[in-house]
Amino acid sequence: MNGRVDYLVTEEEINLTRGPSGLGFNIVGGTDQQYVSNDSGIYVSRIKENGAAALDGRLQEGDKILSVNGQDLKNLLHQDAVDLFRNAGYAVSLRVQHRLQVQNGPIGHRGEGDPSG
């Protein structure tokens, strides 16, 4: 019997300093081009090697960005979200939502103390 896949959702504040080549990541999403069905949020689609985000290490592909420097990213057109990031300044504070996949064991699995015969 297959295990159930659950998700652990956590939020984190990430402060990045814009490097020589910028913040170093790509985004998808927005009200005009939903990346996730029924969700117009902004998601990280790519972390660029050796960019500020990669060197910091906390931002991950698939993360949802909730706000930039305190400005909510809800209900934004894709282009407006890009503009917001590009005009965000040298020190950029991101509120992000991580969605971690948790693999549960199969239904009827042995208890923790049982031997794995």
Epitope: S21, L23, N26, V28, G30, K48, H78
Partner: nanobody
């Protein structure tokens, strides 16, 4: 490998218009992030305008402040061509204009354009405004 060929440059009086074209070949055009740069005599090459197709059904654009409201960048994916419509030209727009391309098909970069981002360049087309 991507090949880029610009056309449409020329001489025009101040206040006039020109439309530059950049024909691309060698790779799926819609996956390319495209831009126009320019280099005036004795100056460094500078960014002018950028256009990308973000893979989710929409285009994105970005302009240097000095051309906003006067220049329009657009693309025709069916024709593998990038355009730069330049209106109300000024003498300070005189330069060699270069088309540039970068393969970046995973969403839109949050970073302002940087010429080091671009992998492929055309040979340039001269624009002279008097």
């Amino acid at each position: 490998e991507v090949q880029l060929v610009e056309s449409g440059g020329g001489s025009v009086q101040a206040g006039g218009s020109l439309r530059l074209s950049c024909a691309a070949s060698g790779r799926t055009f819609s996956s390319l992030r495209m831009a126009w740069f320019r280099q005036a005599p004795g100056k460094e090459r500078e960014f002018v305008a950028e256009n990308w197709w973000n893979g989710q059904g929409g285009q994105g654009v970005w302009y240097v402040d000095s051309v906003k409201g006067r220049f329009t960048i657009s693309r025709d994916n069916a024709k593998n061509t990038l355009y730069l419509q330049m209106n109300n030209l000024k003498p300070e727009d005189t330069a060699v204009y270069y088309c540039a391309a970068h393969r970046d098909d995973s969403g839109s970069t949050v970073d302002p354009p940087n010429q080091s981002d671009y992998d492929y360049w055309g040979q340039g087309t001269q624009v002279t405004v008097s």
